[in-house]
Interface confidence: medium
């Protein structure tokens, strides 16, 4: 399917609106520090050029690859060296090395100010004055903060953002209408970004075999009535889509995602009975709906797996004939029977099965050797079951904030070298698993919890890779994707860690604490908690609880005082002294 002009092909396939949106996202994800106006200018130039190629595919430069065209455009930015330092060296390279270079310089934790939400009237005025600019600004601000955000999905978020303003800016109570919608979009957006980051890490760090295995397991759970051949086709297409998006090929990615949605809707009968309502929707909504679709019902009469994968005398011959297909079918068969297992557990079982076959098919009596392979799965299954049970009990006992604190202490003791902001961010998100998953029925708890934890721990891995400080973190992050969570769960108190020297400044607070939102107050207190544990890693739960209770009381007292700052100045040193004594 070759085209004389790739840029013309994508412009025609996607249409001008989506083309411009995707180019803006691509540029914002590469050059995360550039001002909005600069990006808009570049996008307009690329769009005008694309139109000339649509008019005449043989026109000058229209035959160039998208990487060449986009890279050349990015390299025209005048302040590249001052703003990005060594990233400017990418421009001396030829494609495909230049694009690889840009990808390597994507920053998962860019030094950008947190987005401040203006007053509702201010936002509505901006929306009405220039809707197009308002929506472009949204794409730009999200994309630069989330350089791996799934681009076609970001267009869907922008469409919902637009719909929220169109509806709520007409409402009697604009704020009551708009703010919950914006909160929902923010939370869903962060979750979407983190999920996509795991997909990209899986592809980039562990290769497409790892991603395909993940996709086989997940799609087999979703579409248990589909045949293996059908699941394989979807996996192949989905892998292509995500490889493109993770590689910065956003136009190709969006185009192929649309093709995949079209294929799924044309072949519903052989995929799933749950696709019908998705397929009636417009493109962006349809693709989102298909990605989030609930699991179909399992066929009623699925036979036992043992006959084909354990009892059969041909197991080793079949495995030798086509290892990946045989393992793929095993994973498909296991996953479609177990919507109650996490994808990561299913992948561990497939790995264990593969290891058994590798060992046993070289043994004197292979059948005797692998006869008990399913028994070996039991501890692998019980480990996440027990983990979910224990942590949900703890969550129900403590509530979210205190559950987060328990995790903060647990993880700071495991990896105290990790920066405090990272420990706070990751532990707060780990703690959200309780509210998200523990209320679900038993059969949905493990897939919800463990697959969510994998996403959160990937964030830790991504941040740690940028500034590595802990060999333990590096080991858990790089050795095995599917065993990351069990690896972190198994970490104990780091005995080799030299406690951090006490710094009174870290525990000095001011009256500005009182004007913070509840969330910001929690973050401040949790930051202090991490610093306490870094100072006294062997402090008991009771000691830490005592200090934190005193801290809460001290803040509450001073925030009620007439002269708040004077109270903090006087009570602060007393709190610090009492805390040091309590932890001595």
């Amino acid at each position: 399917d070759t085209h004389k002009s790739e840029v013309a092909h994508r412009f025609k396939d996607l249409g001008e609106e989506h083309f411009k949106g995707l180019v803006l996202v691509a540029f914002s994800q590469y050059l995360q520090q550039c001002p909005f106006e600069e990006h808009v200018k570049l996008v307009n130039e690329v769009t005008e050029f694309a139109k000339t190629c649509v008019a005449d595919e043989s026109a000058e430069n229209c035959d160039k690859s998208l990487h060449t065209l986009f890279g050349d455009k990015l390299c025209t930015v005048a302040t590249l060296r001052e703003t990005y330092g060594e990233m400017a060296d990418c421009c001396a390279k030829q494609e495909p090395e230049r694009n690889e270079c840009f990808l390597q310089h994507k920053d998962d934790n860019p030094n950008l100010p947190p987005l401040v939400r203006p007053e509702v009237d201010v936002m509505c005025t901006a929306f009405h004055d220039n809707e197009a600019t308002f929506l472009k600004k949204y794409l730009y601000e999200v994309a630069r903060r989330h350089p791996y955000f799934y681009a076609p999905e970001l267009l869907f978020f922008a469409a919902r953002y637009k719909a929220a303003f169109a509806e709520c800016c007409q409402a009697a109570d604009k704020a009551a209408c708009l703010l919950p919608k914006l909160d929902e979009l923010r939370d869903e957006g962060k979750a979407s970004s983190a999920k996509q980051r795991l997909k990209c890490a899986s592809l980039q760090k562990f290769g497409d075999r790892a991603f395909k295995a993940w996709a086989v397991a997940r799609l087999s759970q979703k579409f248990p009535k589909a045949e293996f051949a059908e699941v394989s086709k979807l996996v192949t297409d989905l892998t292509k889509v995500h490889t493109e998006c993770c590689h910065g090929d956003l136009l190709e990615c969006a185009d192929d995602r649309a093709d995949l949605a079209k294929y799924m809707c044309e072949n519903q009968d052989s995929i799933s009975s749950k696709l019908k309502e998705c397929c009636d929707k417009p493109l962006l909504e349809k693709s989102h709906c298909l990605a989030e679709v609930e699991n179909d019902e399992m066929p009623a009469d699925l036979p036992s797996l043992a006959a084909d994968y354990v009892e059969s005398k041909d197991v080793c011959k079949n495995y030798a004939e086509a290892k990946d297909v045989f393992l793929g079918m095993f994973l498909y068969e296991y996953a479609r029977r177990h919507p109650d297992y996490s994808v990561m557990l299913l992948l561990r079982l497939a790995k264990a099965y593969e290891a058994t076959l590798e060992k046993c098919c070289a043994a004197a009596d292979p059948h005797e050797c692998y006869a008990k392979v399913f028994d070996e799965f039991q501890p692998l299954v019980e480990e996440p079951q027990n983990l979910v049970k224990q942590n949900c009990e703890l969550f129900e006992q403590l509530g979210e904030y205190k559950f987060q604190n328990a995790l903060l202490v647990r993880y700071t003791k495991k990896v105290p070298q990790v920066s405090t902001p990272t420990l706070v961010e990751v532990s707060r998100n780990l703690g959200k698993v309780g509210a998200k998953c523990c209320k679900l029925p038993e059969a949905k708890r493990m897939p919800c919890a463990e697959d969510y934890l994998s996403v959160v721990l990937n964030r830790l891995c991504v941040l740690h890779e940028k500034t590595p400080v802990s060999e333990k973190v590096t080991k858990c992050c790089t050795e095995s994707l599917v065993n990351r969570r069990p690896c972190f769960s198994a970490l104990e108190l780091d005995e080799a860690y030299v406690p951090k020297a006490f710094n009174a400044e870290t525990f000095t607070f001011h009256a500005d604490m009182c004007t913070l939102s509840e969330k910001e107050k929690q973050v401040k207190k949790q930051t202090a908690l991490v610093e306490l544990v870094k100072h006294k890693p062997k402090a008991t739960k009771e000691q830490l609880k005592g200090v934190m209770d005193n801290f809460a009381a001290f803040v509450e007292k001073c925030c009620k005082a007439d002269d708040k700052e004077a109270c903090f100045a006087e009570e602060g040193p007393k709190f610090v002294a009492a805390s040091q004594a309590a932890l001595a």
């Epitope: 051949a229 004939e321 086509a322 297909v325 079918m329």
Partner: nanobody, 125 residues
Amino acid sequence: EVQLVESGGGLVQAGGSLRLSCTASRRAFIGYAMGWFRQAPGKEREFVAAISWFAGDTTDYADSVKGRFTISRDNAKNTVYLQMNGLKPEDTAVYVCAASSARPMSGRSDEYHYWGQGTQVTVSS
């Protein structure tokens, strides 16, 4: 959808040989058990031979063709073969290829989901 296309049928004298081929459109052909069935005019469809998925190490035959017919598969070519030797007039029928994703191998027609159009084999005496 798996499309199955048979070829190799024809008219042959008793005692002669034919080799039937069945090519599948699906890339995951290796994961299907394959079978040959036949239907003579005015008779029920009957099982002829089956071969297991993957390496195809397990085969099964109807008693009436054992020792004369051989089923095999070439996964690289997405093709299953039926080598028929010592043909008899009672082997005259339309031979139909079928694919099953239900089991690694099966001789039961209800476990096959995909069927070809068939190829005519006529054995004259």
